[in-house]
């Protein structure tokens, strides 16, 4: 061994200086008598070594590294040997920090494993091997006086928790507990906890179960859940308070908390929930009024709330078949009476014959919003209900009566925009209770079954905006019927477009006769098209060779026109414009030449 390094300290604070010396023995005869000692930190040569020959003939080089900024590195003492660097000795240097004070020390007592589990946060990285030890002692008082020491608890490498087994614990008696951190640069200790293991007990949660329905017990109300829990038996004698949390399975709702509940409640009716909704529920408990830790949340229980019977008003409307007045088509619309009005599974139309107490005759059961049935000859009234698994809505009576009320007047309609129509009227006297407004495609596409309808509950209304099922360029028939206490008034109807289309093309012009100064033209009118408003007029335009233009306006029933005052032997361009309220379209251009003065008239 030719060389030897000694260092001021092999482990230092990161960034601190370090001094090293390397001594080369004299008996390394194969060396240059005056060898130059070089220093290397890791792979980098370090300048600044001060070399001297000592009295015993050895060579010494001393170097001071002003800042050791590597957490780990090898410092080598070297000589040039031929063309290569010969390492004579090397030492491992480490730099880091003394341990920070461990913080957030907390413990919990697990009654199943019979151990006190303590955990802490070790603080920032020291870059050095650092050991943690959980230290504790038994104490009669508030840990001011130390009793028997408890065997140190050393966590597995890298872990920041440790378990003190039951044999080292005394329940209902205080223990002093702290964490000691130690490395080559120092020792630190956490603040001491003084605790009775029972005061940090963490219980197991109860098991949630659905309550078995008993025959004599009333079923839960709508929006309610009946549930029970099975306490964790080993914790049964510990007074606890519990809390439930619940949220709908669907959607993004956050948990809602219910509590405190006594552990002993064992069963509970949770209300104020959405009806017919699947919920996830969990429970947890804590020792109380004595100190403790909350248990984990229990495994989830999934339950569905019961429905509520539909709370809706059913607006109804009916019409009889022309050929068979006993065949009735009944229409209805559910109007929610509350924000959550209950799911509707279907509808039933029924009739109770007079004199037959209790006997109800169903006429139809449907999920649709209308049904057609044969009305028994003695029936003047039927009942309509909406239903679901929880029950039915309040029955809506539908009375079939003759039209005996006064009619409304001045029914008119006008377009608001391409997808809505305003229908207005003058209310009759006396005021009706309301109106039924029906609308659907007018002729030739008219169909009774495809009509949309709405109930206007305000008898003083003088109009209604139709926004459903209105498309541009379609002719609509709108029917309004006033409704009275036990009867209705006659229906009135009006036709309207929400938006009309300009004529798609104008009729083709044909020359019928021509002379020197006149020309007779004719055309065949286009047949009327659905969605296109009727023609209001035609305009005929003609232009001479000098680009002078002339025109004449003709009424919509015109089939021809004679141009007078033309120049003989002259060229003219003529076209016809067909116009409606929605716009106008031009025909193709007809070009003609009037006859020469000596020519004969053409017929």
């Amino acid at each position: 061994e030719c060389g030897h390094i000694s260092v001021s300290a092999p482990i230092v604070h990161l960034g601190d200086p370090i001094t090293a010396s390397c001594i080369i023995k004299q008996n390394c005869s194969h060396l240059d008598p005056e060898p130059q000692i070089l220093w290397r930190l890791g792979a980098e040569l370090q300048p600044g070594g001060r070399q001297q020959r000592l009295s015993d003939g050895t060579q010494e080089s001393i170097i001071t590294l002003p800042h050791l900024n590597h957490t780990q590195a090898f410092l080598s003492c070297c000589l040039n040997w031929g063309n290569s660097l010969q390492i004579l000795d090397q030492v491992e240097l480490r730099a880091g920090y003394p341990p920070a004070i461990p913080h957030n020390l907390s413990c919990l007592m697990n009654l199943t494993t019979s151990s006190l589990i303590c955990q802490w946060e070790p603080g920032p990285e020291t870059h050095l091997p650092t050991s943690f030890t959980l230290k504790s002692f038994k104490s009669r008082g508030n840990c001011q006086t130390q009793g028997d020491s408890i065997l140190d608890c050393v966590p597995k490498d890298g872990q920041s928790h440790c378990c003190i087994p039951r044999k080292h614990l005394l329940l209902y008696q205080n223990m002093g507990i702290w964490v000691q951190a130690e490395n080559a640069l120092g020792t630190s200790m956490s603040p001491q906890l003084c605790l009775d293991p029972m005061d940090v007990v963490k219980l197991e949660p109860p098991m949630l179960r659905t309550m078995d329905p008993s025959p004599e017990a009333a079923p839960p109300q709508a929006g309610c859940l009946q549930l029970c829990w099975e306490p964790w038996q080993p914790g049964l004698h510990i007074n606890q308070k519990c809390e439930l949390r619940h949220k709908p399975q669907r959607g993004e709702a956050s948990w809602a908390l219910v509590g405190p509940l006594p552990l002993e409640a064992l069963q509970y009716e949770l209300c104020g929930l959405l009806p017919a909704t699947a919920y996830t529920l969990q429970i947890r408990c804590i020792r109380w009024p004595l100190p403790g830790h909350w248990s984990d949340w229990s495994p989830s229980l999934e339950l569905r709330t019961t429905e509520r019977a539909p709370t809706v008003r059913l607006d109804t409307w009916w019409r009889q078949r022309q050929l068979d007045p006993r065949t009735v088509q009944l229409f209805w619309k559910p109007v929610p009476l509350e924000e959550d009005s209950g799911r509707i599974q279907g509808y039933v139309v029924s009739w109770r014959p007079s004199g037959q107490a209790g006997a109800i005759l169903p006429l139809c059961n449907t999920t649709e919003l209308s049904c057609t049935f044969h009305l028994p000859s003695e029936a003047q009234e039927v009942a309509l209900v909406a239903y679901n698994s929880a029950g039915t809505s309040r029955p809506t009576p539908v009375v079939f009566s003759e039209s005996r009320g006064p009619a409304l007047t001045r029914l008119h309609a006008m377009a608001r925009d391409p997808h809505s129509l305003w229908v207005g009227w003058e209310p009759p006297n006396p005021w009706p209770q309301g109106y039924v407004i029906e609308w659907g495609l007018g002729p030739p596409s008219a169909s009774n079954s495809n009509k949309t309808w709405r109930m206007e509950q305000n008898g003083r209304a003088t109009g209604f905006l139709l926004k459903e099922n209105i498309r541009p360029f379609q002719l609509y028939e709108i029917i309004v019927t006033p409704l009275y206490q036990d009867t209705m008034g006659p229906s009135q109807h009006v036709y309207a477009y929400s938006q009309e289309m300009a004529p798609s093309h104008a009729p083709e012009l044909h020359l019928k006769h021509i002379g020197k100064t006149w020309a007779q033209l004719e055309w065949v009118p286009e047949p009327p098209e659905l969605g296109k408003s009727p023609l209001t007029h035609y305009t005929i335009f003609w232009t001479n060779a000098q680009n002078q233009s002339f025109s004449a306006i003709l009424n919509a029933s015109s089939r021809g026109f004679v141009l007078h005052g033309l120049e003989p032997a002259s060229l003219y361009h003529i076209h016809l414009m067909a116009a409606s309220q929605a716009g106008a379209t031009n025909s193709t251009v007809l070009t003609l030449m009037t006859l020469t003065p000596e020519g004969s008239e053409l017929h």
């Epitope: 009654l111 199943t112 494993t113 019979s114 039951r166 044999k167 329940l171 029972m198 306490p231 038996q233 080993p234 049964l236 004698h237 510990i238 007074n239 006594p262 002993e264 409640a265 064992l266 009024p289």
Partner: antibody, heavy 118, light 107 residues
Framework: EVQLLESGGGLVQPGGSLRLSCAAS????????MGWVRQAPGKGLEWVSS????????PYADSVKGRFTISRDNSKNTLYLQMNSLRAEDTAVYYC???????????WGQGTLVTVSS | DIQMTQSPSSLSASVGDRVTITCRAS??????LNWYQQKPGKAPKLLIY???NLQNGVPSRFSGSGSGTDFTLTISSLQPEDFATYYC?????????FGGGTKVEIK
């Protein structure tokens, strides 16, 4: 000092009824589970029933289920055991016990003798 | 139900002897095991709760150990006042159950 004092024992005919009481003092009665344990002459200990601090939970031994009812009056610091349809095998010394948080009988009364005989 | 089996059912020992009584549960009960001492004509007295915790006022010669299914009560040096019957009891699960008892007699 924690004390439990049973009363109400005595001789009763088979099929008869008896109500035992246990007066508690020296601790906050309403915070603790309480229980009844019996010991037939010359035999070991047998747990009979327990009751939670507020009275909501009342487990029973199978041998007395449906015949005995445990109850408590926290305002009077008193524990009760109503015994109906008594049988000869119910003959025993009945002890009232204060239960600790981990289910141990931390304090016991001196016991009251119930004899069921015709 | 959890069965508790105590052994021996009786033993004879002298003052100063070290005495060990065992109790076995038919299923795991963690540390939920309590030991009682009963003298003739008296109520039982709690010695050890939760397997190894000495009840206040109980002499330190009594100690308990074990967990799961096997438990031991040890009297390190038997005293004249220790001659009595000893019972173990589980409080892990209802119904609460006792062992059959171990009678410690003077040799």
């Amino acid at each position: 000092e924690v004390q439990l004092l049973e009363s109400g024992g005595g001789l009763v005919q088979p099929g008869g009824s008896l109500r035992l009481s246990c007066a508690a003092s020296g601790f906050t009665f309403s915070l603790y589970w309480m229980g009844w344990v019996r010991q037939a002459p010359g035999k070991g200990l047998e747990w009979v029933s327990s009751i939670s601090s507020s009275g909501g939970v009342t487990p029973y031994a199978d041998s007395v289920k449906g015949r005995f009812t445990i109850s408590r009056d926290n305002s009077k610091n008193t524990l009760y055991l109503q015994m109906n349809s008594l049988r000869a095998e119910d003959t025993a010394v009945y002890y009232c016990a204060k239960l600790g948080e981990l289910g141990s009988g931390s304090t016991w009364g001196q016991g009251t003798l119930v004899t069921v005989s015709s | 139900d959890i069965q508790m089996t105590q052994s021996p059912s009786s033993l004879s020992a002298s003052v100063g002897d070290r005495v060990t009584i065992t109790c076995r549960a038919s299923q795991g009960i963690s540390s939920y095991l309590n030991w009682y001492q009963q003298k003739p004509g008296k109520a039982p007295k709690l010695l050890i709760y939760y397997a190894s915790n000495l009840q206040n006022g109980v002499p330190s010669r009594f100690s308990g150990s074990g967990s799961g299914t096997d438990f031991t009560l040890t009297i390190s040096s038997l005293q004249p006042e220790d001659f009595a019957t000893y019972y173990c009891q589980q409080s892990w699960h209802y119904p609460l159950t006792f062992g059959g008892g171990t009678k410690v007699e003077i040799k």
